[in-house]
């Protein structure tokens, strides 16, 4: 066997950028705009195909939006010395379809990460934890924005996109300090069962504009700090007692439920009763029935138990085909 050809002989794939020439203190990468006073670098809509290696060490806010990065390899932001001040990183709309494990390693101050509007066909389970250890070093991330990261259908290959995202969120329990998580507009059909249990510090959770049909297997019990839960524009038909009790038990939460296709039948009775007495739901007077047809556009708060009936199930002997 012949050895792979490379100029490196030591540890493979130690992020090459880490050994790049250190940037000059006031250097600004080509195709970027820099403000040392604002600690900001903007490399926006420049069709960049890779993260610049010569980012200034003072950078606190880095905008890499509207590019053509495609791949974010391990150590994509690793530098020597490290970008110790980088706190906010916006990679939205940069045509990323592959984010590998350790992509955000060596960013000790990274508090906010926005990967929105990238067709993430592959998000490594270790994208945020950086390692495959069962318990990783805590990530410094406080805000993680993952709106509209669902890839086109031809890149989904019959696997669970929800599962892929969930695996990245729970790996190594690295995101225990996360306060804000936005997952809007991702075609989610369900929320994997154990995700929220691994994110106990969440204050703001946005799941709006997905395709969530039910929250039956989702537990909010651990989210004692949760202040805002956005569930607008999903496919929710009813919230069952277990979910209602959990939401009611959260001391600070405000829940947003607009524009869901509520089914106003006998299964809705408990939710209607709860809505009438809870202060948890914002804009609860706007919630209306979508089904059955006879109930369409009726306001949930105006319903009473007599309105909420289910068609009787005929015994088999009386059913007709």
């Amino acid at each position: 066997t012949s050895s792979a050809s490379s100029s490196s002989s030591s540890a493979p794939f130690l992020a090459s950028a880490a050994s790049a020439q250190p940037p000059l203190p006031d250097q600004c990468p080509a195709l970027c705009e820099c403000s040392e006073a604002a600690r900001t670098v903007k490399c926006v809509n420049r069709n960049l195909t890779e993260v610049p290696t010569d980012l200034p060490l003072y950078v606190r806010n880095l905008f890499l939006t509207g590019n053509q990065l495609a791949v974010l390899p391990a150590g994509a932001f690793a530098r020597r010395p490290p970008l110790a001040e980088l706190a906010a990183l916006n990679l939205s709309g940069s045509r990323l379809d592959e984010v590998r494990g350790g992509a955000f390693e060596h960013l000790p101050s990274l508090r906010q990460l926005d990967l929105s509007h990238n067709p993430l066909a592959y998000l490594s389970p270790f994208a945020f934890s950086g390692s495959n250890a069962s318990i990783s070093a805590p990530s410094p991330l406080v805000e993680l924005i993952l709106n509209h990261i669902v890839p086109p259908d031809d890149k989904r290959q019959n696997r669970s996109f929800e599962g892929m995202v969930a695996a990245a969120l729970v790996a190594g329990r690295a995101l225990q300090g996360l306060h804000l998580l936005e997952l809007a507009s991702n075609h989610f059909l369900y929320l994997p069962r154990d995700v929220l249990a691994q994110l106990p510090s969440l204050r703001y959770l946005d799941l709006s504009n997905n395709s969530l049909v039910s929250l039956t297997y989702v537990s909010f019990r651990n989210l004692t700090h949760l202040e805002s839960l956005h569930l607008e524009d999903n496919a929710l038909k009813v919230l069952h007692n277990g979910t209602l009790a959990e939401l009611q038990g959260l001391p600070h939460v405000r829940v947003f439920l607009d524009n869901n296709p509520w089914v106003c039948d006998c299964h809705m009775a408990d939710m209607v009763t709860w809505l009438k007495q809870t202060g948890v739901v914002q804009g609860k007077d706007r919630l209306t029935c979508a089904f059955p047809e006879k109930m369409r556009n009726r306001v949930l708060l105006e319903l009473n138990s007599a309105d909420l009936d289910c068609d009787p199930i005929l015994p088999p002997s009386l059913q007709t085909s």
Partner: antibody
Framework: EVQLVESGGGLVKPGGSLKLSCAAS????????MHWVRQAPEKGLEWVGY????????YYADTVKGRFTISRDNAKNTLFLQMTSLRSEDTAIYYC??????????WGQGTTLTVSS | QLVLTQSPAIMSASPGEKVTITCSAT?????MHWFQQKPVTSPKLWIY???NLASGVPTRFSGSGSGTSYSLTISRMEAEDAATYYC???????????FGSGTKLEIK
């Protein structure tokens, strides 16, 4: 030590098919994207295609799109290139290459494909 | 589609001579990678992201450039530097990875 070893090259008639393999060792194969690159006799380097670390992203050069298929078996640390409808202009040395921190960090030694009647 | 044109196609240099190889892109790119290939061997990553030397590359090599014009420079040519050098970048989405036409560098 990183090793990439290509195999499966040989002589094929025009219109025929062949599958190349690239056996990888010395690194965590499943963490890295992989390329195929070819070099026709006395010519320069030509990128053939790429497959992502998680196998869900594949790109091809226009010259091979619809004829070549890249796949990988992460359990066996192996990359594949299935070639069909082969033409004389596909004659080349075929290299596999890693996409670690940079697009072509490490290269194998190559395997030769000859398409001739 | 991006085309990378290298010049010269072939050149020879004496030991100790300064050598510059250029790579011109048909559209602006944010950086450039360079590869060295010696006869009957596979290519090696030589310079990445315009100016960073890959591990083990002698410091007499350097890279520079921006926009559509990039170059690889050898400050003092040595016999072991005789090889073909390729520039490389990618363009578009889905990405197309493009190599330059190559510059064959010979020792006098």
């Amino acid at each position: 030590e990183v090793q990439l070893v290509e195999s499966g090259g040989g002589l094929v008639k025009p219109g025929g098919s062949l599958k190349l393999s690239c056996a990888a060792s010395g690194f965590t194969f499943s963490d890295y994207g992989m390329h195929w690159v070819r070099q026709a006799p006395e010519k320069g380097l030509e990128w053939v295609g790429y497959i992502s670390s998680g196998t869900y992203v594949v790109y091809y050069a226009d010259t091979v799109k619809g004829r070549f298929t890249i796949s990988r078996d992460n359990a066996k640390n192996t990359l594949f290139l299935q070639m069909t409808s082969l033409r004389s202009e596909d004659t080349a040395i075929y290299y596999c290459s890693t996409y670690g921190s940079n697009p072509f960090d490490y290269w194998g030694q190559g395997t030769t494909l000859t398409v001739s009647s | 589609q991006l085309v990378l044109t290298q010049s010269p196609a072939i050149m020879s240099a004496s030991p100790g001579e300064k050598v510059t190889i250029t790579c011109s892109a048909t559209s602006s790119v944010s950086s450039m990678h360079w590869f060295q290939q010696k006869p009957v061997t596979s290519p090696k990553l030589w310079i990445y992201s315009t100016s960073n030397l890959a591990s083990g590359v002698p410091t007499r090599f350097s890279g520079s450039g921006s926009g559509t014009s990039y170059s690889l420079t050898i400050s003092r040519m040595e016999a072991e530097d005789a090889a073909t050098y390729y520039c490389q970048q990618r363009s578009g989405y889905p990405p197309i990875f493009t190599f330059g036409s190559g510059t064959k560098l010979e020792i006098k």
